[in-house]
Interface confidence: low
């Protein structure tokens, strides 16, 4: 069919140079060189329908979906996958050839599946159709670790079932709060599966292999404490196993401690007890609350009581999925050029997150902190003050968020200007978005102050560079104009900028910048 | 099901050249995202390079960059890694490897379905 647009379905996958992932130099670290997709008509279909050839694609990687379209004058389109459409916004290469493209970051379980691309051009009609699988044969994994008790002795053997077979390590530390941050001289490492000496502050167990580090703690309350303003929660996934260890320090062995779920007693067998002496004689005990594996009724207050300390509770939520709750409603902000700022996303989640910040395709190191109430913050500082879109996409396994965020820095617009045989352009992409003059400088007018009426079209904002909004004004020339200079001007609310073009006939044209 | 038989592997001296070929049984093989793996005596076994299905994407690790390259023919159901100024610490049996059941295979780790059975490559003066 003569009619027939030539396309191109190719497929750019973008190099996971993500530090915080933790990915180890002897994996394949893809080129972004395109692979093409090889677009062959769809026989006997209904209309003009292209299929790619599918793409299997890893947890986590990155990839871009583009069709370049050989085909005269503009095209419009609209992407549709799980039978919601998403937004598309065509532009043109250097071939002329439109380009449309769908990026799907950090690939998950969820956006696996077909995504349509309808494509309707002066001359015909036509769909697209992508499949995009999840590679579901790993060769590596690595899993969170879990506890259980040894059998006929008091300690805790950790467990990570991961591959290759992980490193185990337990992370003791005796202090409280900040100064059991990793790498602090109170921190204590010991790297071995099984742990008796189960009296410590705070105890985590962490696994590590070529896929990076995960790490769980042990849930503890802890009698001497002063309670949290906020109850403490433990969220865990049906067939998890629980863990709750309950602390008291008194000054003789002459206490007890017990656990009770929603006022009653646990099950004989759900929980066992140790006692030490410490270095100054006063009696620690510790009461462990356990479960080999949760269902939804192990849900609830977990409270634990002494006879000589007020008692305290934590609520215990078995979930059939994991979760990540935060507001995902993208948030614009304006700042000055040396104004410090941070984004911060606020999130509650289970299993813990993975997380990236993105700006310019270029991923970023994610750190979280636990925050008081059962909430994680995730903060980014390191924007250089450069304006654009900003992206937290966060992953656990079993849930997927991302929210976006604008940066707008407030600047007085820097021109730039081109022009060819018929036309002159300059863009700028100052903040707020500047307005346009063009003047045209002659012997009636030396200082450049005689306007040009006609001619002129503007666009505000018509390319969007990683979120940065450029905003651009032409100027169409006409034959009696070339051999002329004219200025054009760009102003906002924090000052004007000019250049001055030279319109010549097609060739090398001079810039001179205007002061 | 694809069968995969390596070949080319000996003796060379450091700083010497050598080609391995991998052959593979079946009509899919172009259908296969392709690589070589290697094992060193007492060591696990570890990445060296990969091609895509259309043999236009080429990843390799890093202690190779540079010195070796791989390269597919469809038509002939071979894959190649040809090897330049070789190392002591390149000795390794080589084993070809095909991953991912569909034409296009991005992935950030090596996901193996099918292993060949392998050949000496000794690097020594």
């Known amino acids: 069919n003569q009619d027939l647009p030539v396309i191109k379905c190719v497929l750019i996958n973008h190099k996971n140079n993500d530090s915080s992932v933790g990915k180890s130099s002897s994996y394949p670290m893809v080129s972004e060189s395109p692979e093409d997709l090889g677009c062959a008509l769809r026989p006997q279909s209904a209309g003009t329908v292209y299929e790619a050839a599918t793409v299997e694609v890893d947890v986590s990687a990155s990839i871009t979906l583009q069709v370049l379209v050989d085909t005269p004058g503009n095209i419009s389109c609209l992407w549709v996958f799980k039978h919601s459409s998403l937004n598309c916004q065509p532009h043109f290469d250097v071939q002329n050839r439109g380009v449309v493209s769908m990026v799907i970051l950090k690939m998950t379980e969820t956006q696996a599946g077909e995504y349509l691309l309808f494509i309707q051009s002066e001359a015909t009609n036509y769909t697209i159709v992508f499949t995009v699988s999840i590679r579901n044969t790993l060769l590596f994994t690595l899993r969170r670790p879990y506890f259980r008790k040894m059998e006929n002795q008091d300690a805790l053997v950790c467990i990570s079932e991961s591959v290759p077979e992980p490193i185990v390590e337990w992370v003791l530390c005796d202090s409280q709060g900040e100064s059991c941050k990793e790498e602090s001289p109170a921190v204590v490492k010991k790297e071995e599966k099984v742990l008796h000496e189960l009296f410590g502050t705070d105890i985590r167990c962490c696994a590590r292999n070529e896929l990076g580090r995960e790490c769980t703690r042990l849930f503890t309350i802890d009698l001497n404490q002063t309670p949290q303003t906020t109850l403490p929660q433990l969220f865990l996934k049906v067939g998890e196993p629980l863990w709750i260890r309950c602390k008291a320090v008194h000054v003789n062995h002459g206490f007890g401690l017990t656990w009770e779920l929603e006022n009653k007693a646990l099950e004989e067998g759900s929980y066992f007890e140790m006692s030490t002496y410490s270095t100054n004689r006063t009696m620690i005990r510790i009461l462990f609350a356990f479960v080999s594996s949760v269902a939804r009724n192990d849900t609830g207050y977990y409270t634990c009581s002494s006879s000589k300390h007020p008692s305290q509770s934590a609520l215990v939520t078995i979930v059939e999925k994991g979760f990540i709750n935060a507001t995902n409603s993208s948030e614009d902000y304006e700042i000055d050029q040396y104004e410090e700022f941070c984004f911060s996303v606020r999130f509650k989640a289970y299993p813990q997150i993975r997380c990236t910040w993105t700006f310019s395709r270029k991923a970023f190191p994610c750190e979280q902190k636990a925050l008081d109430d059962g909430y994680s913050v995730s903060k980014f500082c390191n924007h250089k003050h450069q304006p654009g879109e900003y992206i937290f996409h966060a992953e656990n396994g079993d849930a997927q968020f991302t929210k976006m965020f604008t940066l707008n820095i407030r600047r007085k617009p820097q021109v730039l200007a081109e022009a060819s045989a018929s036309q002159a352009s300059c863009s700028s992409d100052g903040y707020p978005l500047p307005s346009w003059t063009w003047k045209k400088c002659s012997d009636k007018s030396p200082n450049c102050t005689e306007d040009i009426p006609e001619g002129v079209w503007n666009r505000k904002a018509n390319r969007k560079v990683f979120g940065q909004w450029v905003s651009s004004s032409t100027l169409n020339m006409s034959e009696a104009m070339k051999g002329f200079l004219v200025k054009c001007c760009a102003y906002n609310s924090l000052g004007t900028s000019c250049e001055t073009i030279l319109l010549n006939s097609p060739g090398p044209f001079p810039f001179i910048q205007d002061s | 099901e694809v069968q995969l038989l390596e070949s080319g592997g000996g003796l060379v001296q450091p700083g010497g050249s050598l080609t391995l070929s991998c052959a593979a049984s079946?009509?899919?093989?172009?259908?296969?995202?392709m690589g070589w793996f290697r094992q060193a005596p007492g060591k696990e076994r570890e990445f060296v390079a990969a091609?895509?299905?259309?043999?236009?994407?080429?990843y390799y690790a890093d202690s190779v960059k540079g010195r070796f390259t791989i390269s597919r023919d469809n038509s002939k159901n071979t894959l190649y890694l040809q090897m330049n100024s070789l190392r002591a610490e390149d000795t390794a049996v080589y084993y070809c490897?095909?991953?991912?059941?569909?034409?296009?295979?991005?992935?950030?780790?090596?996901?193996?379905?099918?292993w060949g059975q392998g050949t000496l490559v000794t690097v020594s003066s």
């Open positions: 079946g009509r899919t093989f172009s259908s296969y995202a």
């Open positions: 490897a095909a991953g991912g059941s569909t034409r296009v295979v991005v992935t950030t780790t090596p996901v193996v379905k099918y």
């Open positions: 091609i895509s299905w259309s043999g236009s994407s080429t």
